[in-house]
Every structure is written in C-alpha cells, then in structure tokens.
C-alpha cells in the first residue's frame, strides 16, 4: 500500500438550503482506471463515513440512490456535493479517495474540510 | 464515550505465545492511533507498539522487534497486539491507548494518547 496525496478546501459554508460543495483533487502517481472516494465525518472524537463511491476513469461518479452525496469527476479532480445538511452536521468532512485498479493499491486522505451548516431563520407570518 | 478495553492476557512459558486484544465500546476506533504501553514491576511504564489510523505506520520498541506484531481489524473493531517468542522480561500489565487525531496525522503514530484502558496482565514465567 503507497500513500498520495490529496488536497480539500479548509472550510465550506453550507447554503441556506443545506447543501455543500467541495473539490476532492488527489495526485495520482500512475494511470489508475477504478478509483473509490469515500467520505468521512469526524466529530467528537469519531469517525463515521458519510458516503462512498467506486468509479471508472471518465465515467461517472455514482452513490447509492439513498446517499445524500452527489458528484462528478474531471480528471485526477472529484466534485463533491453534500445534501441535507442541518446545523447539527457541522464538522470536518474528509475526503479519502483510493485507486483500486490496476495495482499498486494507493490510499490518500485529506486533511478535511470544516463544512459549516446554519439551519435558516422561519420566516415570520405575514400579516396579508 | 468511547472506552477501552484490553483482554488476552494470563501467564504463559518462555517462548509461548499470547495476542492481546483493545476492543471499544460505546464508539468505533477507525482512523485512531492505537497504543500498546506496558508496565513492569517496578519500572516506567514504556510504548511497545503503536499503529497508525490508517494502518499503514506501525512502530516497535527495540525490545520487541521481530516478536511483537500490532495489527487492526476494523470490522471487529479492536487491534490486536500478537507476543511470540515471550520472555521473562515481557512480564506486566499491557495497556491499549488512543487518540483520534486530525487527518493530516492519520498515517502518523500519536506523541500522546487521551485514552487509556484498564490493562491485562502478562506472566512469562516457568
């Protein structure tokens, strides 16, 4: 097992709607064609993975139909984009990205972005 | 809160073998630094072993080199000290420590550890 780099944004701020974006870019030391990016939540002394996905090389990044990620890849570049997010899931969101295939197996691990989530004001009621 | 938990120990001959075993409870141990420290009768209480978050960085007190073989297995949750080839001076109680640290520390072995289990005693004796 090799270890390579990877590069994240050091803070996100969610929208007001709950969705964070971030670019996940790792430095491959060689041609990879299956790549695994998995993302990770540490918070109060806790790791919990957030989701994860196996792609080809110029194909599509695609989750599970239940998964709250959603991205795209470009290159040695993920776009990572986060949703439903809520106040209570602010934290470092690490990206850890692994080039499965072909061998040798490689293992980067960012040092984390600080997603922050600010759950939006109800709107008062309106008088009209 | 996470807390740690050793078992594995008892007494054993010069030249047997015993795995010790740091399990969590109340939480996982993914990505943490674990720790083996051990204390003799007596004496300080040394770092035999510890093992990266990733599993990729393990470290071995000179004494222990060749004989010892700290491992994770992260779908049990617990890391595993394997002793071989124990000696009269291997006698003690073992302690499983832990620190999560940031990820840019996670291929590293912790300097400090904030958790310390309860520790299992060691007896190499004839």
């Known amino acids: 097992c090799k270890a390579m780099h990877v590069a994240q944004p050091a803070v996100v701020l969610a929208s007001s709607r709950g969705i964070a974006s971030f670019v996940c870019e790792y430095a491959s030391p060689g041609k990879a064609t299956e790549v695994r990016v998995t993302v990770l939540r540490q918070a109060d002394s806790q790791v919990t993975e957030v989701c994860a996905a196996t792609y080809m090389m110029g194909n599509e990044l695609t989750f599970l139909d239940d998964s709250i990620c959603t991205g795209t890849s470009s290159g040695n570049q993920v776009n990572l984009t986060i949703q439903g997010l809520r106040a209570m899931d602010t934290g470092l969101y690490i990206c850890k990205v692994e080039l499965m295939y072909p061998p040798p197996y490689y293992l980067g691990i960012g040092n984390g972005t600080q997603i922050y989530v600010i759950d939006p004001e109800p709107c008062p009621d309106s008088d009209f | 809160e996470v807390q740690l938990v050793e078992s594995g120990g008892g007494l054993v001959q010069p030249g047997g073998s015993l795995r010790l075993s740091c399990a969590a409870s109340?939480?996982?141990?993914?990505?943490?630094?674990i720790g083996w420290f051990r204390q003799a009768p007596g004496k300080e209480r040394e770092e035999v072993s510890c093992?990266?978050?990733?599993?990729?960085?393990?470290n071995y007190a000179d004494s222990v080199k060749g004989r010892f073989t700290i491992s994770r297995d992260n779908s049990k949750n617990t890391v595993i000290l394997q002793m071989n080839s124990l000696r009269a001076e291997d006698t003690g109680v073992y302690y499983c420590?832990?620190?999560?640290?940031?990820?840019?520390?996670?291929?590293?072995?912790?300097?400090?550890?904030?958790?310390w289990g309860q520790g299992t005693q060691v007896t190499v004796s004839s």
């Open positions: 420590t832990g620190k999560l640290l940031h990820p840019s520390l996670w291929s590293a072995c912790a300097n400090e550890y904030d958790l």
């Open positions: 093992i990266s978050g990733t599993g990729l960085r393990t």
């Open positions: 109340g939480g996982t141990l993914d990505y943490w630094s």
